[in-house]
Amino acid sequence: GWVWNQFFVPEEMNTTSHHIGQLRSDLDNGNNSFQYKLLGAGAGSTFIIDERTGDIYAIQKLDREERSLYILRAQVIDIATGRAVEPESEFVIKVSDINDNEPKFLDEPYEAIVPEMSPEGTLVIQVTASDADDPSSGNNARLLYSLLQGQPYFSVEPTTGVIRISSKMDRELQDEYWVIIQAKDMIGQPGALSGTTSVLIKLSDVNDNKPIFKESLYRLTVSESAPTGTSIGTIMAYDNDIGENAEMDYSIEEDDSQTFDIITNHETQEGIVILKKKVDFEHQNHYGIRAKVKNHHVPEQLMKYHTEASTTFIKIQVEDVDEP
């Protein structure tokens, strides 16, 4: 019968011929009366056999990631008779792995959106690197992830590549962050290869800013001839949030005379001071009212940023009109 052990050849061997092992018949007594032959894909070009001894050699550099095993056939012939000594046999040469591939992030570019002020531990995104080396061969393809840029706001789970928030972020201070993640094979041991990827993390807005009047005092004038419903001026508050989080409503907080009203222009987010009832210069030539501004909608968990509405004082001077 045939005698052989499992055949392995390391990939990327630079030697011109590398001894892999020996194929022999147990009928071979070593007197050079048998001839060994190698058949199949790679026979003669990649692998050769010593016809007398059955020693097999690799004569080319192999790349496991291109081809990880070769299935060959062996024959042994009695030189004297030309007849087969053993039935033709199939055998396998496995290409063993070396750590010659760095981890690669295949889904680049990575981009994620996460709400500002999210608590620590909030999941942002998972990045995954792949390593073409053999996952069953030692640690060549066992990866560890680490953060090269992004502290103290982000962390990455070493074995999963899951990026989480590690410190609250405020969109109004910084609205996007570049995080750089490294994947290292060999679980970070000496000889490890690495790859990096960038993740753009954008913060989406939450309603953590209340509208605030730019001015604490406005001065407006109204003619005593102005009919009710007249717009006598505008007031303006600023809200650093965006979109619906910046939508605001203006209202009167104090107006003892009940002479004025404020309506909100939702296009411009301005407050329009309206004359609610006619004024008379001879009766009262100036008024003082206080206006307030609030966001349209504030979720309960964000009320701590909206404890007291901003107000402004409006001084309104009545202009005299000559009366017949």
């Epitope: 405020d170 969109r171 109004e172 201070l173 910084q174 609205d175 953590d208 800013n209 605030i212 730019k214 001015e215 604490s216 005092l217 600023y238 650093n240 701590k304 940023y305 404890t307 007291e308 509405a309 901003s310 107000t311």
Partner: antibody, heavy 125, light 107 residues
Framework: QVQLVESGGGVVQPGRSLRLSCAAS????????IHWVRQAPGKGLEWVAV????????YYADSVKGRFTISRDNSKNTLYLQMNSLRAEDSAVYYC??????????????????WGQGTTVTVSS | SYELTQPPSVSVSPGQTASITCSGD??????VSWYQQKPGQSPILVIY???KWPSGIPERFSGSNSGNTATLTISGTQAMDEADYYC?????????FGGGTKLTVLS
């Protein structure tokens, strides 16, 4: 790292002028408004002036209005404070400080998150 | 012009809670920032927008603001917290600082 470094301080006579500089590094200078804040010896902080990220708006404390001018050169990452008609009461350590908040935000709700080490101005005859 | 008033000094024993107040007309309607300044050093922002922490500031520091008074609270006060503290607000395009409070941590 993020840094502001003031220079240009010194001893000057009343009525004379002085120009302070503030060199920024480690961040995108053109995205931030910058303040000048001063502190007289043994006293508290006093705000002096602010300039918006693009130089479009400048505001001053009443105590320096008409005498001091704040400006910036974004190509040089540098802020300036031109101080004219100096008085004894202008003697202080002058700090530049970054206004926290991205472009497009208004107001000074987010504080001053980066400060220089200060430069000393002494107005004395 | 708008004014912010702080007590000149506050004393606290180590491990106790220190409270520093800052008062101003309708201050609760505005947003307040707080700064810590140690002798010979530049100020450091410790609280902004009433109750938010800048990166790197321990959560022993907290802030609140309501009515006419904003408060900086330091829980579990340590010797290293001894410093001057300033409140700051914004009014009509100008910045206003309080007069400062010297926090003494009793030994």
């Amino acid at each position: 790292q993020v840094q502001l470094v003031e220079s240009g301080g010194g001893v000057v006579q009343p009525g004379r002028s002085l120009r302070l500089s503030c060199a920024a590094s480690g961040f995108t200078f053109s995205r931030y408004g910058i303040h000048w804040v001063r502190q007289a010896p043994g006293k508290g902080l006093e705000w002096v002036a602010v300039i918006w990220y693009d130089g479009s708006n400048k505001y001053y404390a009443d105590s320096v209005k008409g005498r001091f001018t704040i400006s910036r050169d974004n190509s040089k990452n540098t802020l300036y404070l031109q101080m004219n008609s100096l008085r004894a009461e202008d003697s202080a350590v002058y700090y530049c400080a970054r206004r926290a908040g991205i472009p497009g935000t208004t107001g000074y709700y987010y504080g001053m998150d980066v400060w220089g080490q200060g430069t000393t101005v002494t107005v004395s005859s | 012009s708008y004014e912010l008033t702080q007590p000149p000094s506050v004393s606290v024993s180590p491990g106790q809670t220190a409270s520093i107040t800052c008062s101003g007309d309708r201050l609760g309607e505005k947003y307040v920032s707080w700064y810590q300044q140690k002798p010979g050093q530049s100020p450091i922002l410790v609280i902004y927008q009433d109750n938010k922490w800048p990166s790197g500031i321990p959560e022993r520091f907290s802030g609140s603001n309501s009515g006419n008074t904003a408060t900086l609270t330091i829980s579990g006060t340590q010797a290293m917290d001894e410093a001057d503290y300033y409140c700051q607000a914004w009014d009509s395009s100008t910045v206003v600082f309080g007069g400062g409070t010297k926090l003494t941590v009793l030994s």
